[in-house]
Interface confidence: medium
Amino acid sequence: GSERTCCPVNWVEHERSCYWFSRSGKAWADADNYCRLEDAHLVVVTSWEEQKFVQHHIGPVNTWMGLHDQNGPWKWVDGTDYETGFKNWRPEQPDDWYGHGLGGGEDCAHFTDDGRWNDDVCQRPYRWVCETELDKASQEPPLL
């Protein structure tokens, strides 16, 4: 595929990545799939500067990010190392709370109203942010 050198229409460029901010809500898996269909992934936050940039756009609204522990350990969807990477959890989070009565614990991470992170039930219909890196090979076939 060809390298992406500029962001798609309605995406915002920042530090060699492109971001798309939803205005509706989906379950985490549906949001994850939406981003993948756009040749992107749910946002992966690697620094305080990126955290601030994303929060600037989403405001004080619960919003999914590309971080989950559905298979055990916490993992970023793009393979970024969780243990050594940037974190911005709320105090006492993540807590894998079972008291919500929806079955199971809490396996998906989201931005809360103050920007810090919380784990929650993955089926909740929150807004989401997609991210794709510039200069990566896109999956589109080359023009003939």
């Epitope: 915002v12 460029e13 920042h14 901010f21 500067e49 601030k52 600037h56 405001g59 004080p60 103050d114």
Partner: antibody, heavy 119, light 110 residues
Amino acid sequence: QVQLQESGPGLVKPSQTLSLTCTVSGGSISSGGYYWSWIRQHPGKGLEWIGYIYYSGSTYYNPSLKSRVTISVDTSKNQFSLKLSSVTAADTAVYYCARDSPLRGFDYWGQGTLVTVSS
Amino acid sequence: QTVVTQEPSLTVSPGGTVTLTCASSTGAVTSGSYPNWFQQKPGQAPRALIYSTSNKHSWTPARFSGSLLGGKAALTLSGVQPEDEADYYCLLYYGGAQVAFGGGTKLTVL
């Protein structure tokens, strides 16, 4: 040290378009990570955010002014510009340009330029 | 349109302590609003004092501090100096990359 300097006509006639330019020195607009902003202050009043632009060209405007505002960037000149159309006397104000860093907020400001709308 | 509200005016004695607040019509101000505070003296451009609730710029005097207080952003001046007499503005960030300034507080040092 980043410095910003506004320039443009100090007098604009009603119904015309106000045009201002902000020249940035001490740092490159195209280095990324910053929003280049316009703010105004009516005489004796508070500050009003007009809008800003990212170096890639993405713009964000105050909803109350959106229909009349255009902000553009010229990275080759390290400048960004404001155009405000169909001005009236109510647009008479000191216009400031400023840099907004997602990490450090509105940290650097120009000294401001007074624009009077009068025939 | 979001409205950001500040006390129109406050008076403090030299050496005293005063707290200015900043409220949002959308509800409680949180750290996710990344409150900024600015000082403006007559005939001058605003000067940034505080960013992201409580962080000081390198030029911000130690007597200025920012915090969240009862659902509002707050700027506290401790050991007020005569040169602190000025207008003070807060700024809040909102979703969609929008920002809004407060109406300003005129601080008089008597």
